[in-house]
Interface confidence: medium
């Protein structure tokens, strides 16, 4: 059993990675029909991973701690936000000794409900179901659940069919504050204004592996390319720069966040939609000079160092956008606010 006593976010992330492995890897105890299917995690909009503390046999579970991550518009996972769980009832009442939980948030509205409110009650407006198990194909009729939330519980190392309806995920503000060294809301952590901490690399490694598994199973709908095209053509936040404790992370934080009503809205500079008519390919190549170094965040990004001269292939009217450029034979997109016109 994983330690459920609320601790710091670093150990929570480590614990979460361990739990997720236990829920998804085929072992002598977990046969191929006793794991969370890759596509469930690959398609999830959010994921909560917790361990639960129980006062004793036949006694209601008292609560638990863990983390939640959200899927960003570009397909990557957000930084982790610390959470607790309360109001555990259901199967717990009859003595099922649940140790670890994985909660799959299938829809954006489930993630947003938690991020905006700081807590999320399972059930009611958000339908909850025990999540499907096994390496079933995604199209399997039995798996076509419309539930907003899937729950996976383990009891004594085995899956237990407990839906967790009526229990509540709670934002742990103090844990987040201590880890991120600032007062920060779950919304800003989960919706991409916060860097993925290096301490959670284990967790991201296993999360990213599900996307690969899912794609390898022939279920790919070229999500990466679509995300990249969306990022180029629609309003989306620029990559930020280091904000707090850069030694903890190579990815940075952005301060200029905008409207919160829609995850895909332009988060850096609200109200800039009029700037986003594409100028398209340029007749005369424009050269820009990099003010700051930019390390690409995903394939298709253009890496450059401060001082590099980039040939712009296509641009918008706004400096607060992604442009396309060419450097040393490589073509890719880059944040225009990192460069200056020559």
């Amino acid at each position: 059993m994983n330690n459920p006593i609320p601790s710091n976010l670093k150990s929570e992330a480590k614990k979460a990675a361990k739990i997720l492995r236990e829920f998804t890897e085929i072992t002598s105890r977990n046969g191929p029909d006793k794991i969370i299917p890759a596509h469930v995690i690959a398609k999830a909009k959010g994921l909560a991973i917790l361990s639960v503390i129980k006062a004793g046999f036949l006694v209601t579970a008292r609560g638990g701690s863990g983390i939640v991550v959200a899927r960003l518009p570009d397909g990557k996972w957000s930084a982790p936000s610390a959470i607790g769980i309360a109001g555990l009832g259901g199967g717990f009442e009859i003595g099922i000794e649940v140790s670890d939980l994985v909660i799959i948030l299938n829809y954006d509205r489930a993630v947003e409900a938690f991020a905006k409110g700081g807590n999320l009650t399972l059930g009611g407006n958000l339908t909850v179901a025990v999540g499907p198990l096994g390496r079933n194909l995604e199209g399997n009729v039995a798996l076509r659940s419309s539930a907003a939330v899937f729950t996976y519980c383990k009891s004594r190392g085995l899956f237990a069919g407990v839906s967790l309806e009526g229990s509540c995920l709670i934002e742990r503000k103090e844990t987040n504050r201590k880890f991120y060294c600032q007062d920060i809301r779950a919304y800003d952590i989960l919706f991409g204004d916060t860097p993925r901490p290096a301490q959670a690399e284990d967790l991201y490694e296993i999360l990213d592996s599900f996307t690969e598994k899912y794609e390898n199973e022939g279920q790919r709908i070229n999500a990466r390319k679509a995300a990249r095209e969306q990022r180029k053509s629609s309003a989306k936040e620029l990559p930020p720069k280091p904000l707090s404790r850069p030694q903890q992370s190579s990815a940075p934080v952005q301060l200029n966040s905008g409207s919160q009503s829609n995850r895909n809205e332009y988060k850096l500079y609200p109200g800039l939609s009029s700037y986003h008519e594409r100028v398209g390919n340029l007749n005369q190549p424009i050269e820009v000079t990099a003010l700051y170094s930019f390390e690409g965040q995903q394939p298709g990004d253009l890496n450059f160092q401060a001082g590099d001269r980039i040939t712009v292939i296509s641009k918008t009217d706004s400096h607060f956008d992604w442009w396309e450029g060419k450097l040393r034979g490589q073509t890719g997109i880059f944040p225009a606010n990192y460069v200056t016109m020559n």
Epitope: C181, Q182, D183, I184, R185, Y187, D188, D193, L238, P240, K241, P242, L243, S244, R245, P246, Q247, Q254, L255, N256, S257, G258, S259, Q260, L268, Y269, P270, G271, L272, L291, Y292, S293, A306, H319, F320, N337
Partner: antibody, heavy 119, light 107 residues
Framework: EVQLVESGGGLVQPGGSLRLSCAAS????????MSWVRQAPGKGLEWVSA????????YYADSVKGRFTISRDNSKNTLYLQMNSLRAEDTAVYYC????????????WGQGTLVTVSS | DIQMTQSPSSLSASVGDRVTITCRAS??????LNWYQQKPGKAPKLLIY???RLQSGVPSRFSGSGSGTDFTLTISSLQPEDFATYYC?????????FGQGTKVEIK
């Protein structure tokens, strides 16, 4: 013309409170993070607090954490700094500053407002 | 927190002199370094950003250089209006910190 005008400074007793305002004009206020920077008499510049464009994220220097609250009203193009439990060492000229391009630098500064904490 | 150390803390120079101010960061900050000028009773004014980029409207006699931990502000030919206090500031990580300032006085 891009302009920032601070107000609300004055004399206050230790333990007292004060609210500073910064009226912005000449740029789309909600698009930019804003910051407060202070300067004690005869001393250097010290960053105090910052707030994101939407107001959803706030940041504080350790010296003011828990006592000062930064906020903004984008409909009024105004930045605020609520200062509670004031101490003698908070005596300074307080400047508001506009942060350009993802907090790369402070490109526009107000003229400053003097806060004196003394009994 | 990243500490910024300027040297010298003050200097005396004459009009036409070449003046150099240095700023050292306690850890590498790449080129996330800005320079400000402040005159008595006035607000600071941005001179240089990204270590070497001249802010619009600032005379070309001001220049900046450096990367990593060591940075320099140079005034190629000191003018009467340049007598002021100069501050470096890192924008690499929060809290954003300033150097203690360098006062340039008339010799």
């Amino acid at each position: 013309e891009v302009q920032l005008v601070e107000s609300g400074g004055g004399l206050v007793q230790p333990g007292g409170s004060l609210r500073l305002s910064c009226a912005a004009s000449g740029f789309t206020f909600s698009n930019y993070a804003m910051s407060w920077v202070r300067q004690a008499p005869g001393k250097g510049l010290e960053w105090v607090s910052a707030i994101s464009g939407s107001g959803s994220s706030t940041y504080y220097a350790d010296s003011v954490k828990g006592r000062f609250t930064i906020s903004r009203d984008n409909s009024k193009n105004t930045l605020y700094l609520q200062m509670n439990s004031l101490r003698a060492e908070d005596t300074a000229v307080y400047y508001c500053a506009k942060a350009e391009y993802s907090y790369l630098y402070f490109d526009i500064w107000g003229q400053g407002t003097l806060v004196t904490v003394s009994s | 927190d990243i500490q910024m150390t300027q040297s010298p803390s003050s200097l005396s120079a004459s009009v036409g002199d070449r003046v150099t101010i240095t700023c050292r960061a306690s850890q590498s900050i790449s080129n996330w370094l800005n320079w400000y000028q402040q005159k008595p009773g006035k607000a600071p004014k941005l001179l240089i950003y990204a270590a070497s980029r001249l802010q619009s409207g600032v005379p070309s006699r001001f220049s900046g250089s450096g990367s990593g931990t060591d940075f320099t502000l140079t005034i190629s030919s000191l003018q009467p209006e340049d007598f002021a206090t100069y501050y470096c500031q890192q924008s690499y990580s929060s809290p954003w910190t300033f150097g203690q300032g360098t006062k340039v006085e008339i010799k």
